[in-house]
């Protein structure tokens, strides 16, 4: 008779995560008598994956019924795969011995693969905000997937960006994968609206790649620019001078007034008004009593922006004259007028 | 659902023997060892030994080759554990287990008395 | 036969705390790659029930406060946060040659 020989047929089978390997083993005789046990790997360090008689096995199913007389068929099936479960399978033969079964044959092995589904991509802009005509950087980070061939594409509204580096980690052969791409962005003004996307394309997504994104409203701060105005007199004694706040983001503002560098009034930024561009503005008045003043008065409109060093816009208020329409801007009312920052 | 129904509760006399039942439900009955354990009021487990049902083959442990018998009837899914010359030291709750650990009968406790 | 010792014989510990029980082994438990060492708890009245397999692998419905380690001939069984519920004996078990026990270690609350 001709000695048993152990066949797998399949050198290798393709399994998703989550489902179900069936590794196929028959066996060509029913003698020499001695169980058959399924390893994952070779030579001593390999792992014991079923075994007929003896262990605990929860994932692990025969395919035929192995008590059956004559059954020759010794494939299993292996559940809820996951990464971690790839590697190369052999069905062996033993034969009776003591104290231990020896082995007699082993099949030529049946590589399993498994193919897992990237992680959403997580996608995470830098700590700190930062001004318009900055370069900020992104992460993007996906994990979990297999094979290792991948593919990571960033976008900021719908173009493309090309200033990116992307690692696919580890460089060796692993069960599983995760991929680091970091992107640099430039800022713009008008970016309080704008989303930068990261996007992963892989061989389990079926043509339906993840998507990750960051609003670059958790990003970017747009400055103010101040415009301090006279408006004209509603009194003999009264002016009314305003202090137009635009264009900023995000809104955290606070406003303070100063006649003559002494402290006015404080206020915080409540009933703004948006522009289109998700930018913010925003008007304080003061009402000056020109007859408690002697001197010229200088008054400053001082701003502080998120946190940010104070900038201020400077106006002076001529007392001596009382023009019934006094214009704004002009040489002599504004002479201070150009923004600085106050430390 | 898999489970091992054990025979109840045996008082006997020295020296006599006493045959304890193991039925097995919810499983194919001939795909694993079957095992029998020993466990003497507050103490410890003892293997005693294993029979293949899909062929009668037994391993005992020499402590109790000459102590106990293992038996299996297929037809009716039923192991059974005979104890001979019975001594105080017999004394003890009996336990078949199947080979995946995870499935134990409740128990069979023997006593020996005069 | 292979030996199991097992230590300490008794141990109490604070809820909430960690429980560590080991189990020696007189020679290796090792079939090729894999550790073939079990454990079990047991309840008074009850069968035992089987915690951890294969070394570290949790059982069934186990809870996750369970762990098991170790290779060769060096054992160990974890409990963290040991809860009310924990108060148990607890056995290691080998089966690389037929089946064997350590003595058992009775768990109790400080």
């Known amino acids: 008779e001709e000695e048993l020989q152990v066949i797998q047929p399949d050198k290798s089978v393709l399994v998703a995560a989550g489902e179900t390997a069936t590794l196929r083993c028959t066996a060509t005789s029913l003698i020499p008598v001695g169980p058959i046990q399924w390893f994952r790997g070779a030579g001593p360090g390999r792992e014991l994956i079923y075994n007929q008689k003896e262990g605990h096995f929860p994932r692990v199913t025969t395919v035929s019924d192995l008590t059956k007389r004559n059954n020759m068929d010794f494939s299993i099936r292996i559940g809820n795969i996951t990464p971690a479960d790839a590697g190369t399978y052999y069905c062996v033969k033993f034969r009776k011995g003591s104290p231990d079964d020896v082995e007699f044959k082993s099949g030529a092995g049946t590589e399993l693969s498994v193919r897992a589904k990237p992680s959403a991509p997580v996608v995470s802009g830098p700590a700190a905000r930062a001004t318009p005509q900055h370069t900020v950087s992104f992460t993007c980070e996906s994990h979990g997937f297999s094979p290792r061939d991948i593919t990571l594409k960033w976008f900021k509204n719908g173009n493309e960006l090309s200033d990116f580096q992307t690692n696919v980690d580890p460089v060796g052969e692993s069960v599983s994968y995760s991929i680091h791409s970091t992107a640099k962005v430039v800022l713009t003004r008008e970016d309080v609206h704008s989303q930068v996307i990261c996007e992963v394309a892989h061989v389990t997504l079926q043509g339906d790649p993840l998507r990750g994104t960051a609003n670059l409203s958790e990003t970017i701060r747009v400055p103010p620019t101040l415009e301090v105005t006279q408006q004209p007199v509603r009194a003999e004694n009264q002016v009314n001078v305003t202090c137009q706040v635009r264009k900023f983001y995000p809104q955290r503002l606070q406003l303070t007034w100063l006649e003559n560098g002494n402290v006015s009034r404080t206020e915080t930024a409540s009933t703004v008004t948006e522009n289109k561009d998700g930018t913010y503005n925003w008007m304080s008045w003061l009402l000056v009593n020109v007859s408690a003043h002697r001197d010229d008065v200088k008054l400053t409109c001082q701003v502080e922006h998120d946190g940010q060093p104070a900038v201020s816009k400077s106006h002076d208020l001529k007392v001596s004259a009382h023009p019934k329409e006094q214009g704004s801007n002009t040489a002599a009312e504004n002479t201070g007028s150009n923004e600085r920052n106050i430390y | 659902e898999v489970q091992l129904q054990q025979s109840g509760a045996e008082l006997v006399k020295p020296g006599a023997s006493v045959k304890v039942s193991c039925t097995g439900s919810?499983?194919?009955?001939?795909?694993?060892?079957l095992h029998w354990v020993k466990q003497r009021p507050e103490q410890g487990l003892e293997w005693i030994g294993r029979?293949?049902?899909?062929?009668?083959?037994?391993k005992y442990d020499p402590k109790f080759q000459d102590k106990a018998t293992l038996t299996a009837d297929t037809a009716s899914n039923t192991a059974y554990l005979q104890i001979s010359s019975l001594t105080s030291e017999d004394t003890a709750v009996y336990y078949c287990?199947?080979?995946?650990?995870?499935?134990w009968g409740q128990g069979t406790l023997v006593t020996v008395s005069a | 036969d292979i030996v199991l010792t097992q230590s300490p014989a008794s141990l109490a510990v604070s809820l909430g705390q960690r429980a560590t029980i080991s189990c020696r082994a007189s020679e290796s438990v090792q079939y090729y790659g894999t550790s073939l060492m079990q454990w079990y708890q047991q309840k008074p009245g009850q069968p035992p029930k089987l915690l951890i397999y294969a070394a570290s692998n949790v059982g069934s419905g186990v809870p996750a406060r369970f762990s098991g380690s170790g290779s060769g001939t060096d054992f160990s069984l974890n409990i963290h946060p040991v809860e009310e519920d924990d108060i148990a004996m607890y056995f290691c078990q080998q089966t690389r040659r037929v089946w064997t026990f350590g003595g058992g270690t009775k768990l109790e609350i400080k």
């Open positions: 287990a199947r080979g995946n650990y995870v499935h």
């Open positions: 029979i293949d049902p899909e062929n009668d083959s037994t």
């Open positions: 919810g499983f194919n009955f001939k795909d694993m060892y």
